[in-house]
């Protein structure tokens, strides 16, 4: 899911050729190049599906495409949390999960994506024009949020074409610092490249352990994705606002997807692709921050307030959460 750049293996310079300084100037540009290639705007994608079997049941999937480690995911409906939305679930990679009705099953699908099922039990069921939002807090990117809802109409069983959705807000404090460093690095890289322009290029050889040198890969954000950064909050359709969940009406309809990545450059795959994509066992994740594999165990179906914490030996589970939301 994450953008990676694989750098060709460098052959150490021969003694006396460039010496220690030569080695440093040789490696540094490649390190900086890697940073420049991988440094892109983080993305959040949201997918909403109405189940064909349970016509008022929704599945929301959200993912974060960035290089940072996710510290918190907040799912809300009716709009962004803090802007008229209602928190449905809070997922923390170490502190666990809390959720509120009509959320039934919030869980980690991968270390950078989550899913949430909203039950359609008549009175408390969501409806088709409800807006669902996912906010990912990560380090060092900050907080990124995107919203999505089912499009007005679509063919049953088909995935709606991915469209750029707004990244609704970002905490720039963490982002600007990193961006500044990367910008400086990229400028410095250009400077080095210009300086080495008239020198003989260093000899690059494939790694001896593999017959073929891996190629550097990068994906540049499209113009559409760049523009997405400036799109304001989507207007919330109030005809089915979950202001009082006990009076919301169930909504029938076919099973179809609204796929809303924030960047057109990284489009999440449709349901068929997910089926073949290896996903960790239900409720498992890898803790990026401490480098430990932590098995979260079963994440049960929930229709009400739910909390998954792990005080047992299966993983570190400190319990002073940052949020007072459920």
């Amino acid at each position: 899911m994450r953008t990676e750049a694989q750098v060709p293996a460098l052959q150490p310079p021969e003694p006396g050729l460039e010496g220690a300084m030569g080695h440093r100037t040789l490696v540094l540009p490649w390190v900086l190049l890697t940073l420049c290639v991988t440094a892109g705007t983080p993305e959040v994608w949201v997918q909403v599906r109405m189940e064909a079997t349970e016509l008022s049941s929704f599945t929301i999937r959200c993912g974060f495409l960035g290089s940072g480690s996710i510290s918190l995911v907040t799912v809300s409906w009716g709009g962004p949390n803090g802007a008229g939305g209602t928190t449905l679930a809070v997922l923390h990679p170490e502190r666990g999960i809390r959720q509120w009705a009509p959320a039934r099953q919030a869980r980690w699908e991968t270390q950078s994506s989550i899913s949430l099922i909203l039950e359609g039990s008549g009175a408390s069921s969501p409806c088709a024009n409800t807006t669902f939002c996912c906010k990912f807090a990560s380090f060092p990117e900050g907080s990124w949020e995107a919203c999505g809802s089912l499009p007005p109409s679509s063919d049953p069983g088909l995935s709606a074409p991915p469209t750029p959705a707004p990244i609704l807000r970002a905490d720039l404090a963490g982002i600007l610092g990193v961006s500044g460093v990367l910008l400086f690095g990229c400028v410095y890289l250009l400077h080095l490249l210009r300086r080495h322009k008239h020198r003989p290029a260093p000899r690059l050889q494939p790694s001896r352990t593999s017959p073929q040198a891996p190629r550097a890969r990068a994906w540049a954000p499209s113009q559409a994705s760049q523009a997405a950064l400036h799109v304001p909050y989507a207007t919330i359709n109030t005809s089915c606002r979950p202001a009082t969940l006990d009076t919301a009406h169930p909504h029938g309809g076919p099973s179809w997807w609204a796929s809303l990545p924030t960047h057109a450059a990284h489009r999440p795959q449709g349901p068929a692709a997910w089926a073949s994509t290896p996903i960790p066992a239900r409720g498992s994740f890898v803790s990026v921050e401490n480098g430990l594999y932590a098995q979260a165990g079963e994440r049960p179906p929930h229709t009400g307030p739910g909390l998954t914490l792990f005080p047992d030996p299966r993983g570190p589970r400190a319990m002073e959460g940052p949020l007072g939301v459920r």
């Epitope: 008229g84 939305g85 209602t86 979950p242 929930h302 949020l323």
Partner: antibody
Amino acid sequence: QVQLQQSGPELMKPGASLKISCKASGYTFTDSYINWVKQRPGQGLEWIGWIFPGSGSTYYNEKFKGTATLTVDKSSSTAYMLLSSLTSEDSAAYFCARDGGLRGPFDYWGQGTTLTVSS
Amino acid sequence: DIQMTQSPSSLSASLGGKVTITCKASQDINKYIAWYQHKPGKGPRLLIHYTSTLQSGIPSRFSGSGSGRDYFFSISNLESEDIATYYCLQYDHLLTFGGGTKLEIK
């Protein structure tokens, strides 16, 4: 520090309505669900329902639908519960409680409001 | 709806002793249980959530365990200030309290 301050005791007549208040302080009011809990004399605790102050979304225990109405005033960080068509069955202590999210359910409570319904 | 059966409804123990309270759910609640201490004239106090996670500031004399449908709450080295009524709360599916256990000191 987090505090929930409830309105004082009430003596009401059957058929009347009463609005109990719960003023929150020490945290971001709009970020946490507020729950209401009933305790009849000598009996246990019963969950009435919750409200999310940020949006006004509510969810009720089936038993209390139609008799309890939850609202909030964001400007004063106050949650309210309106009890209508009071009967002697409504005589009880009523508590508001904040849902602490990842810190656990009902991590802070109000001191309670005692309601007596008598003719 | 999930029902919570709490037992015993009352118990008496000696200072310095240990007591255990049980809550049985009508279905698997996946460890989503919290325990509260309630004293007259006050709001209840959260002691433990997610079966065994001690709330900040709560002494380690209080502990919780269990899984599936059966859950246990214990107080060791009983002190006079522990006199109260204790409630379990399931929050796997909406919210349901147990009937309460009144603790007295012999």
